[in-house]
Interface confidence: low
Amino acid sequence: MGSAALEILGLVLCLVGWGGLILACGLPMWQVTAFLDHNIVTAQTTWKGLWMSCVVQSTGHMQCKVYDSVLALSTEVQAARALTVGAVLLAFVALFVTLAGAQCTTCVAPGPAKARVALTGGVLYLLCGLLALVPLCWFANIVVREFYDPSVPVSQKYELGAALYIGWAATALLMVGGGLLCCGAWVCTSRPDLSFPVKYSAPRRPTATGDYDKKNYV
């Protein structure tokens, strides 16, 4: 596969991953109440996210409440907020860096420098994935630990929410996409013949040997 194809595929995966990360960050379903044993009339499921908590009645009625004070939040929620938002912003920066290093753009002149810019974009997406993975795994660890903690009442136990799964899928896409971008950039630096389009010049006069200059041919 040519580097341009790797670049496009990598960028598409990273953009989808970025969208997934934004979705995971905003969704209130980082943890959901585990047990639904009660009367369907009054039964309710609690969702908790980074920014708000929601109570969903069995009737389908949902009531959400944005967390009032940042200082009142637990350390893990504050840290998860910072890391997730950081990852989203880093992905935004990575997008511009990747576009600047892309073969189809003219922000940076073609050559090794452009390939290095593209490589930087790929690395940034990899970092973005790793950065997002930290709060996701941290949160999951807390939920699982509390689920098996005998000091937490049965009715107060939570399970992993949809947002965590979306987040994990998003980080996987970011890291795979970032990896493809890095591969594409590496191909550019190591095999220029597979990357930048050849600029053909007008044919020269035949050489003394009668052969055409072969430098423009693979």
């Epitope: 044993d37 009660h38 009367n39 369907i40 009054t42 000091s151 107060q156």
Partner: antibody, heavy 120, light 112 residues
Framework: EVQLVESGGGLVQPKGSLKLSCAAS????????MHWVRQAPGKGLEWVAR??????????YYVDSVKDRFIISRDDSQSMLYLQVNNLKTEDTAMYYC???????????WGQGTTLTVSS | DIVMSQSPSSLPVSVGQKVTMTCKSS????????????LAWYQQKPGQSPKLLIY???TRESGVPDRFTGSGSGTDFTLTISSVKAEDLAIYYC????????FGGGTRLEIK
């Protein structure tokens, strides 16, 4: 009106077996966790076993003294709760109550009880 | 396991008198995340099944007369009957549902 009616109690010899039943009506049985609580003659209440709803994979819990001897089960289609009691001991003699775990996690409805007597 | 202790085991009272019975748990029943105490009180009249009176340590079950009041937090709880009536003759049990379910030994309310 919520009703829990126990049956199946009786006189059993030590090491014997029996199956206690509880017929539930007046509520959506399949979404509630259900329990068995017993009361020895002249004594206090002792929680015996719990079975959760289908949404919780029918998870079961037992008091240590009856683990490996008692089996709690349910049939949601019939709104029935069961307690299979095996390898009975004289100390299992008690009134056995079928109980619903209500919306506040505690026991909001109790049956009238069925008496199990273990004696040789 | 959480152990529940009730005192007194027997409480002779006169009709109209105010009574208080206590319940202690071997570990805190307060869950800080929701600020709820996982404790309930039940009344068992002679020859009858137990009946839920109070849950979350202080919330009266619907239909329970307001002379019954639950209070306390953490490990120490009380049930108060502001003015005892003859029909209150019963055994009162506290129960923790913080970690599975354990009952106290009961307090027998006897009318003098």
């Amino acid at each position: 009106e919520v009703q829990l009616v126990e049956s199946g109690g009786g006189l059993v010899q030590p090491k014997g077996s029996l199956k206690l039943s509880c017929a539930a009506s007046g509520f959506t049985f399949n979404i509630y966790a259900m329990h068995w609580v017993r009361q020895a003659p002249g004594k206090g209440l002792e929680w015996v076993a719990r079975i959760r709803s289908k949404s919780s994979n029918y998870a079961t819990y037992y008091v240590d003294s009856v683990k490996d001897r008692f089996i709690i089960s349910r049939d949601d289609s019939q709104s029935m709760l069961y307690l299979q009691v095996n390898n009975l001991k004289t100390e299992d003699t008690a009134m056995y109550y079928c109980v619903r775990e209500g919306n506040w996690d505690c026991f909001d409805y109790w049956g009238q009880g069925t008496t199990l007597t273990v004696s040789s | 396991d959480i152990v529940m202790s009730q005192s007194p085991s027997s409480l002779p009272v006169s009709v109209g008198q105010k009574v208080t019975m206590t319940c202690k748990s071997s570990q805190s029943l307060l869950y800080t995340s929701n600020q709820k105490n996982y404790l309930a009180w039940y009344q068992q009249k002679p020859g009858q099944s137990p009946k839920l009176l109070i849950y979350w340590a202080s919330t009266r079950e619907s239909g329970v007369p307001d002379r019954f009041t639950g209070s306390g937090s953490g490990t120490d709880f009380t049930l108060t009957i502001s003015s005892v009536k003859a029909e209150d003759l019963a055994i009162y049990y506290c129960q923790q549902y913080y970690r599975y379910h354990t009952f106290g030994g009961g307090t027998r309310l006897e009318i003098k």
